[in-house]
């Protein structure tokens, strides 16, 4: 029986050109995590394997960094990075747990946008 739950950062936003950490945490289970896969819609971004360590898909090598922990850091964000991200925990003996994060990449931060139009 699968008793674990995945906690994620949920819906997050970041500024274009900046970076963001995607983080998931598996709790409420004693199952051994053998591998965590990170996917963006139908694209494999990275894999963290308990034995082999990290593998970053070559097409994302310039913009994806492993960690912290089992998380993933996305750098040099573009508006095209907006969308769903999934952390897929492969565990033994439980099986597979999946967490979802929605990232919105904004053209500019609300704070900057507001400051630009302040009346002196």
């Amino acid at each position: 029986m699968m008793t674990g739950t995945i906690e994620t950062t949920g819906n997050i936003s970041a500024e274009k050109g900046g970076s963001i950490i995607l983080q998931c945490h598996l709790s409420s289970t004693t199952a051994q995590v053998t591998q965590v896969n990170w996917e963006q819609q139908d694209q494999l971004l990275a894999i963290c394997n308990a034995d082999l360590g990290w593998h970053i898909s070559p097409s994302f090598k310039d913009r994806v960094a492993p960690g912290p922990g089992l998380g993933l850091t996305l750098q040099s964000l573009t508006v095209n990075d907006t969308g769903e991200y999934f952390c897929i925990y492969h565990t033994y003996p439980d099986g597979t747990y999946t967490g979802r994060i929605f990232l919105e990449v904004l053209e500019s931060s609300v704070a900057e946008h507001g400051a630009r139009f302040q009346i002196p």
Epitope: T34, L44, N49, S59, Y92
Partner: antibody, heavy 118, light 107 residues
Framework: EVQLLESGGGLVQPGGSLRLSCAAS????????MHWVRQAPGKGLEWVSG????????SYADSVKGRFTISRDNSKNTLYLQMNSLRAEDTAVYYC???????????WGQGTLVTVSS | DIQMTQSPSSLSASVGDRVTITCRAS??????LNWYQQKPGKAPKLLIY???SLQSGVPSRFSGSGSGTDFTLTISSLQPEDFATYYC?????????FGGGTKVEIK
């Protein structure tokens, strides 16, 4: 250099048994999932079985479930496939394969031929 | 089980031709799709993994694309050593399954 060397193939009668071995070298065997894939003469590739790096998790094709057993000895860098109740349709070249990240086969052995015939 | 359908089953081409092989999965497999090349009497060789990642040491004339259910292997300029049989394989779930193969022959 990664090397996978299968052995144990041969001619066996229907209902008989064989044990295939795959000796691995050139990499940390205990860190990789390993699989068996077979190819009947003139046919395509068919996945047979897989085992996790520590041997704790195994999986089988429906066509061999209950008859074949995959195992590994990490201290000997060796993968095994125990094949019982063999049938004519099990005739094939059997390949041992290394599977990083449980996602693709990056190295294959040269294969060993199993012929099941009376 | 996830069925993998490859097309065409065979094709004839000349050196220098651009060759495209397609593979369709019976359900979405994200990008867990790999391509192998096999020559007669030899073990298969990994060309492309995770749909579009080129395996180390494989010439850049080989490329892969696609996600979900539809995938493509392209050889941009066919070389004499590329005449072989090509297989796709899904690693989204067990049982792992292969396409039926595409034999690339000399025209």
């Amino acid at each position: 250099e990664v090397q996978l060397l299968e052995s144990g193939g041969g001619l066996v009668q229907p209902g008989g048994s064989l044990r295939l071995s795959c000796a691995a070298s050139g990499f940390t065997f205990s860190s990789y999932a390993m699989h068996w894939v077979r190819q009947a003469p003139g046919k395509g590739l068919e996945w047979v079985s897989g085992i996790s790096s520590n041997g704790g998790s195994t999986s089988y094709a429906d066509s061999v479930k209950g008859r074949f057993t995959i195992s590994r000895d990490n201290s000997k860098n060796t993968l095994y496939l125990q094949m019982n109740s063999l049938r004519a349709e099990d005739t094939a070249v059997y390949y041992c394969a290394r599977v990083p990240y449980s996602a693709w086969i990056d190295y294959w052995g040269q294969g060993t031929l199993v012929t099941v015939s009376s | 089980d996830i069925q993998m359908t490859q097309s065409p089953s065979s094709l004839s081409a000349s050196v220098g031709d651009r060759v495209t092989i397609t593979c369709r999965a019976s359900q979405s497999i994200s990008s867990y799709l790999n391509w192998y090349q096999q020559k007669p009497g030899k073990a298969p060789k990994l060309l492309i993994y995770a749909a579009s990642s080129l395996q180390s040491g494989v010439p850049s004339r080989f490329s892969g694309s696609g996600s979900g259910t539809d995938f493509t292997l392209t050889i941009s300029s066919l070389q004499p050593e590329d005449f072989a049989t090509y297989y796709c394989q899904q690693s989204y779930s067990t049982p792992l399954t292969f396409g039926g193969g595409t034999k690339v022959e000399i025209k």
